[in-house]
């Protein structure tokens, strides 16, 4: 099985114990590590952070001790914006320029492939996204002709039904991608006005439309129905939780909220907590399991957080094995307890290790 793990370059800027550099990563933990994110400037793939080149080097030296490790560079992301991607992909010349710029950039910096993180193609971009993938793959095949190992091509796709329908021609893009990471998280957020888990494995007992689509099981089933080969589908598992501020004394699933949860001490983003921050939060919190959805949530005071733990990730891995998928994807290594100092287990990357162990179990 593949274990595809994202590392985010901006995690270097977190304070104190939250700061994560690629040299803190475990070279034997994942089969693939994806560095997020690269930029596109003047239609050429480019660095984003001032010290990206240094961090690329840090990441890729992990392969010195583990030659089986593959590294990919992810281009795009939330801050890049869909519009910019759209302009490049829809223009033949811009697209060609971008595609041509990718292999030398990846080779120069020691990457084994490219991950496309266009979040998200609009309805009018559907065909252009397919063309971009098809032409990128063709370029990778051509570039590898002189006996070089062919560069890998992957894409991170939304797990939301509406986005899947409007953005992707799954059957076509699957032919050209080496693997597809389905982002089976962020199904529920503060915009809903109630508490809810952002990455449930299954549908909740009370879920009516459209909530009945907001779970991992539905997203995976729908992707397969649309023609994604199970052998290329990698299922996303988050090492972060989504938090809410409760608006009343109700604390269960579906309780009213006044907004996102308070920012974490290190990640500093309202409504999001890294797993290592959740381990802190759990001291003195009440933990519940959403039985049907097979995921936990915790409450403390007026704070509510839905997250994944070692038990839920094992359930998710068993599920992806039952579905005969290619493996698991983790967002993100730097949100796991990468130092092993928060979750009281004397173990670095406890969630990702639990995923790895479950994948290896027979």
């Amino acid at each position: 099985y593949k274990l595809v793990c994202y590392y985010t370059s901006w995690s270097q800027y977190r304070e104190g114990d939250g700061s994560c550099f690629p040299d803190a990563l475990d070279r034997f933990l994942c089969t693939h590590i994806i560095y997020s994110f690269a930029n596109i400037s003047n239609d050429h793939i480019d660095t984003w952070e001032w010290n990206d080149v240094t961090l690329y080097g840090m990441l890729n030296t992990l392969k010195n001790r583990n030659p089986n490790l593959k590294t990919l560079l992810s281009v795009g992301g939330w801050n890049f914006g869909s519009q910019r991607f759209s302009k490049i992909a829809s223009n033949t010349q811009s697209r060609r320029t971008f595609i041509k710029s990718v292999p030398p950039f990846l080779r120069t910096h020691g990457f084994d492939g490219l991950d496309l993180a266009w979040l998200y193609p609009g309805r009018r971009d559907k065909q252009h996204f397919t063309t971009l993938i098809k032409e990128m793959k063709a370029e990778f095949i051509k570039e590898a002709q002189p006996g070089k190992k062919q560069l890998l091509l992957s894409a991170a796709l939304s797990a939301g039904k509406v986005t899947i329908d409007s953005s992707y021609d799954i059957a076509k893009i699957s032919q050209h991608l080496d693997f597809i990471s389905i982002m089976t998280y962020d199904f529920h957020g503060a915009w809903r006005g109630t508490t809810g888990h952002h990455s449930p494995l299954f549908r909740g007992q009370e879920d009516a439309s459209p909530d009945r689509f907001s779970n991992t099981d539905y997203a995976v089933g729908y992707m397969l129905r649309l023609g994604a080969p199970a052998s290329k589908l990698v299922m996303g598992i988050p090492t972060f939780g989504r938090s809410f501020t409760l608006a009343s004394s109700e604390t269960g699933v579906g309780a009213p909220i006044s907004g996102p949860g308070i920012p974490g001490r290190f990640t500093k983003e309202a409504g999001t907590l890294a797993y290592y921050e959740i381990c802190d939060f759990l001291r003195g919190a009440t933990v519940h399991r959403i039985l049907g959805q097979q995921v936990p949530y915790a409450t403390k005071g007026n704070q509510w957080v839905g997250y994944d733990d070692q038990e839920s990730v094992k359930s998710k891995v068993q599920y992806l094995k039952d579905r005969q998928l290619a493996g698991a994807m983790v967002w993100a290594l730097d949100l796991d307890d990468f130092q092993g100092s928060f979750c009281g287990q004397d173990l670095r990357f406890p969630l990702t290790n639990a995923i790895k162990d479950a994948l290896a179990a027979t």
């Epitope: 329908d165 059957a171 439309s209 009945r212 099981d217 397969l224 129905r225 649309l226």
Partner: antibody, heavy 118, light 107 residues
């Protein structure tokens, strides 16, 4: 009210071809997956295949994939089943059905009968 | 392909009784199971989807349960119009496959 009306059935010789149609009304046809299901006389239901709204995905029962072609024309609100190389075991009542977003088929036509005989 | 084994093939029961039909999947299908009713000379009608969810307009005497590989369909108080055929269908992996059917007969 959603209505599905199949047509095009009849008597066809072994090895011959036939094209069935299913006209949909009462719904935004272009938003929905559509399916074909058949039922041989006195037998159970057999799923033939399905097509997604923009025709980019068509799934078939493997044993029928080389004989049957499913297509649709959203402008005409019509689903089609092109049958070829028919044999006596293809004698059945052919239903078109509309799967809901939960994949189960919540609307069915009345069926059109196909008899394969020389 | 996933095989669906439905039992019994036929069952006799009396008005007002309860009856249970079973469907076994050849591999796990989660809760991706539907139940249909078919009256003689009519097209099938969806009763249950997602193993346990009642389709719109279906009387509450019909219920579904189960997950994984074993599923049950229950009619709690049989009425005259219920003595017809019932089919299960898995929607976990294409090709979607049906069980062989169960014919309910009046005692």
């Amino acid at each position: 009210e959603v209505k599905l009306l199949e047509s095009g059935g009849g008597l066809v010789q072994p090895g011959g071809s036939l094209k069935l149609s299913c006209a949909a009304s009462g719904c935004d046809f272009s938003r929905y997956w559509m399916s074909w299901v058949r039922q041989a006389p006195g037998k159970g239901l057999e799923w033939i295949g399905e097509i997604n709204p923009d025709s980019s995905t068509i799934n078939y029962t493997p044993s029928l994939k080389d004989k049957f072609i499913i297509s649709r024309d959203n402008a005409k609100n019509t689903l089609y089943l092109q049958m070829s190389k028919v044999r006596s075991e293809d004698t059945a009542l052919y239903y078109c059905a509309r799967p809901e977003d939960h994949f189960a088929m919540d609307y069915w036509g009345q069926g059109t009968s196909v008899t394969v005989s020389s | 392909d996933i095989q669906m084994t439905q039992s019994p093939a036929s069952q006799s029961a009396s008005l007002g009784e309860s009856v249970t039909i079973t469907c076994l999947a050849s591999q796990t299908i989660g809760t991706w199971l539907a139940w249909y009713q078919q009256k003689p000379g009519k097209s099938p009608q969806l009763l249950i989807y997602a193993a346990t969810s009642l389709a719109d307009g279906v009387p509450s005497r019909f219920s579904g349960s189960g997950s994984g590989t074993k599923f049950s369909f229950k009619i709690s108080s049989l009425q005259a119009e219920d003595f017809v055929s019932y089919y299960c269908q898995q929607l976990y992996s294409t090709p979607w496959t049906f069980g062989g059917g169960t014919k309910l007969e009046i005692k």
